[in-house]
Interface confidence: medium
């Protein structure tokens, strides 16, 4: 069962500056929308270690965004 519900941004807290690349299973980018006016970078960690929000202003987040955009466009 979901423990907490809300309809705003997907991340709370400013986000971590970096995550070890070896620990990353996947990265998801949420672009600004009606629900949230900022870009969010969500990292899913390997071995069921949960998820982390990357600070979108961090160097690693900027690199991930670039990489994903290159792949998609």
């Amino acid at each position: 069962f979901p423990m907490f519900k809300r309809g705003r941004c997907l991340c709370i807290g400013p986000g971590v500056k970096a995550v070890k690349v070896a620990d990353i299973e996947k990265a998801s980018i949420m672009y600004p929308s009606n629900n949230c006016d900022k870009i969010e970078v969500i990292i899913t960690l390997k071995e069921n270690k949960g998820q982390r929000c990357l600070n979108p202003k961090s160097k690693q987040a900027r690199l991930i965004i670039k990489k994903v955009e290159r792949k998609n466009f």
């Epitope: 423990m3 991340c11 807290g13 929000c53």
Partner: nanobody
């Protein structure tokens, strides 16, 4: 050095109240989300409540909604868990923990202890019937 120190636990009768403070030091309070977890003997650690000091957002597990209230005093770098209407099933060791970020999917958060960077030592809460 980052430290989280819980206090305020004890023995209380069913229906009673306790207030658990979690004093934080060694990091910028506003940059973190503070969560309360609990662990009863033989059970997994479960999320109870959390608060984001930066915007005051609060969240509660269904089992404690309407009975527990989380609040923070940023000047004192302390988060409080006010527990009213305590039940025997609330008996557990209560831990506070800190993380710099928690993501949601589909507007829901599933508490995962792995997502928290720092933990306190815990405080025992026993509710007798």
């Amino acid at each position: 050095e980052v430290q989280l120190v819980e206090s305020g636990g004890g023995l209380v009768q069913a229906g009673g109240s306790l207030r658990l403070p979690c004093a934080a030091s060694g990091f910028t309070f506003d940059d973190y989300v503070i969560g309360w977890f609990r662990q009863a003997p033989g059970k997994e650690r479960e999320g109870v409540s959390l608060i984001s000091s930066s915007d005051g957002s609060t969240y509660y597990a269904d089992s404690v909604k309407g009975r527990f209230t989380i609040s923070s005093d940023n000047a004192k770098n302390t988060v409080y868990l006010q527990m009213n209407g305590l039940k025997p099933e609330d008996t557990a060791v209560y831990y506070c923990a800190a993380t710099s970020s928690i993501p949601y999917y589909s507007g829901s958060y599933y508490p995962n202890p792995f997502e928290y960077d720092y933990w306190g030592q815990g405080t025992q809460v026993t509710v007798s019937s």
